[in-house]
């Protein structure tokens, strides 16, 4: 029997300081260019090294990122968004939702005392 | 990956000009913002133009506002670098680099992902 993949989602509070080498990450998604079907939203697809996202070490790419200096991203357009954060100056406070991947055991009794899970 | 080449370098006098070329292949050409840097024998890595991808806006270093011009042709994927009133330290490799969706102002080199190999201009 197959396991189930279920997500465990956070959110989280993010304040980078775009340093001499930038907040060095690169976004995805917008209304024009959905990166997820049916979610207009925006999502971090790569992190560059040597950014201050790497060097704080909390954004993930596959990130959500729901807010920019409290300004919501919804229904923006992908280079509206890209705007955004090219104008968002040196002290960048960002809202992000972290999908974490929870894989569960196979559906079924699991026995007392079984360690796996 | 883009694959990007540069050509039209040279060497030209003081004053003349020189148009540089980049030609992209690899992805959509039109979405990506294309930039051109420069480095010259001793020195750091300097921004010199930048055009970005969706709306076509320029941006240029002070030290050369004026005296070129970064435009692109889609239809070719190509960014082009017209050079006018070329001055001794204009000399230089000028660098040809492309990016996407950076959140990164395009005068930095982080904005971008991929990079020619350079092509050789000369101030007499």
């Known amino acids: 029997m197959n396991g189930r993949v279920d997500y465990l989602v956070t959110e989280e509070e993010i304040n980078l300081t775009r340093g001499p080498s930038g907040l060095g990450f690169n976004i995805v998604g917008g209304t024009d260019q959905q990166y997820v079907s049916n979610d207009s939203g925006i999502y971090v697809s790569r992190i560059k090294e040597n950014g201050a996202a790497a060097l704080d070490g909390r954004l993930q790419e596959g990130d959500k990122i729901l807010s920019v200096n409290g300004q919501d991203l919804k229904n923006l357009l992908h280079q509206d968004a890209v705007d955004l954060f090219r104008n968002a100056g040196y002290a960048v406070s960002l809202r992000v939702q972290h999908r974490l991947q929870v894989q569960n055991g196979p559906i079924g009794h699991r026995g007392e005392g079984d360690p796996s899970g | 990956q883009v694959q990007l080449v540069e050509s039209g370098g040279g060497l030209v006098q003081a004053g003349g000009s020189l148009r540089l070329s980049c030609a992209a292949s690899?992805?959509?050409?039109?979405?990506?913002?294309m930039g051109w840097f420069r480095r010259a024998p001793g020195k750091e890595r300097e921004f010199v133009a930048a055009?970005?991808?969706?709306?076509?806006?320029?941006d240029y270093s002070d030290s050369v506002k004026g005296r070129f011009t970064i435009s692109r042709d889609n239809a070719k994927n190509t960014v082009y670098l017209q050079m006018n009133r070329l001055k001794p330290e204009d000399a230089a490799v000028y660098y040809c680099?492309?990016?996407?969706?950076?959140?990164?102002?395009?005068?930095?080199?982080?904005?971008?992902?991929?990079w020619g190999q350079g092509t050789q201009v000369t101030v007499s």
């Open positions: 690899g992805r959509s050409f039109s979405s990506l913002d």
């Open positions: 055009i970005s991808g969706s709306r076509g806006s320029t």
């Open positions: 680099a492309a990016g996407f969706g950076s959140v990164d102002g395009l005068e930095y080199p982080i904005s971008y992902d991929d």
